[in-house]
């Protein structure tokens, strides 16, 4: 079971409207030049196997590689969102520094890799789907780890 | 084919018990939680409660020492144990399956069983 | 406890309408609403999640939209089949788990 009380995050990081709206934009803005819609990658396989109390844990996961592997490279792209909303997401990253999982966590691992691969296989266009899915991404953390 | 079928209702006595079984195939009790939900006459959907994959469980307020959920993995299925029945406990019972997507939705769910607690 | 409110309680419509109902939360819910549709004497269906996502072999005449508290479901040109019942239900997390998921009351659409 995860160490649960390092898997939260206050709700109050969700409560300021103003990244908020910024994070739904830049996902919006990117959804418009997402040209492959039969691909989702936050959704029901994701979570495939995966506790309740696990969510967390795997939404870290997703948050940081979705930061090192997609928003840091693309990073000039989508101005002047993505220089607002790459630093709440890093703040975010770091506050679960400290979540982890005792005992095994291979169905994540599993789970997250295959979301990494997907990624991976579509080349840019995997970058800017993932970009695209931030509000996803943004609720989906919220739903997890509040 | 995923299916969830719900047996085990009928009339039951005010303070008689009864034990609601949910059997599921197409998909494994080990990888998604289950939702028992119930619909009084005319009235609208009430949540009863929840197992997860870990075989954690949580209720609705209302439900909490009444109502018990459990499973049988072995035997594809969940169960919704119901003491110290009222009258207003009439209703058909449901069961579904609760997809986590980022958030939960329940899909699909059994045809129901009724309830009916009479003397 | 979020409450939601449905409204109207029932309404009648005809063949070929567009018909709107809405779902109002008693508190911020973000988009962690869904909408459902019940036939009677069957069970529900679900239909909408992410308060705008339409579920896998849901006709596109079905839509969903809003965020925070006001929600609404719009059904673009009423078929036969679309008489029946439709409930919202929103997930609350962060709280007390014994009140995590909630049903609107319902609005019930009939042949006018």
């Known amino acids: 079971a995860p160490i649960s009380s390092h898997c939260r995050l206050d709700k109050s990081n969700f409560q300021q409207p103003y990244i908020t709206n910024r994070t739904f934009m830049l996902a919006k803005e990117a959804s418009l030049a997402d040209n492959n819609t039969d691909v989702r990658l936050i959704g029901e396989k994701l979570f495939h196997g995966v506790s309740m109390s696990e969510r967390c844990y795997l939404m870290k996961q997703v948050l940081n590689f979705t930061l090192e592997e997609v928003l840091f490279p693309q990073s000039d792209r989508f101005q002047p969102y993505m220089q607002e909303v790459v630093p709440f997401l890093a703040r975010l990253s770091n506050r679960l520094s400290t979540c982890h999982i005792e005992g095994d966590d291979l169905h994540i691992q599993r789970n997250v890799q295959k979301l990494k691969d997907t990624v991976k296989k579509l080349g840019e266009s995997g970058e800017i789907k993932a970009i695209g899915e931030l509000d996803l991404l943004f609720m989906s953390l919220r739903n997890a780890c509040i | 084919e995923v299916q969830l079928v719900e047996s085990g209702g009928g009339l039951v006595q005010p303070g008689g018990s009864l034990r609601l079984s949910c059997a599921v195939s197409?998909?494994?009790?080990?990888?998604?939680?289950m939702i028992w939900v119930r619909q009084a006459p005319g009235k609208g959907l009430e949540w009863i409660g929840i197992?997860?994959?870990?075989?954690?469980?949580y209720y609705a307020s209302w439900a909490k020492g009444r109502f018990t959920i459990s499973r049988d993995s072995s035997k594809n299925t969940v169960y919704l144990q119901m003491n110290s029945l009222r009258a207003e406990d009439t209703a058909v019972y449901y069961c579904?399956?609760?997809?986590?997507?980022?958030?939960?939705?329940?899909?699909?769910w059994g045809q129901g069983t009724l309830v009916t607690v009479s003397s | 406890a979020v409450v939601l409110t449905q409204s109207p309680s029932s309404l009648s419509a005809s063949v070929g309408d567009r018909v709107t109902i809405t779902c109002q939360a008693s508190?911020?819910?973000?988009?962690?609403l869904a909408w459902y549709q019940q036939k009677p004497g069957k069970a529900p269906k679900l239909l909408i999640y992410?308060?705008?996502t339409l579920a896998s072999g849901v006709p596109s005449r079905f839509s969903g939209s809003g965020s925070g508290t006001d929600f609404t479901l719009t059904i673009s040109s009423l078929q036969p089949e679309d008489f029946a019942t439709y409930y919202c239900q929103a997930c609350v997390y962060g709280n007390a788990a014994d009140s995590r998921y909630t049903f609107g009351g319902g609005t019930k659409v009939e042949i006018k």
């Open positions: 579904a399956r609760d997809r986590f997507v980022g958030v939960d939705i329940f899909d699909p």
């Open positions: 197992i997860d994959i870990d075989g954690s469980t």
């Open positions: 992410w308060a705008s």
């Open positions: 197409g998909f494994s009790l080990s990888s998604y939680a």
């Open positions: 508190e911020d819910i973000y988009t962690n």
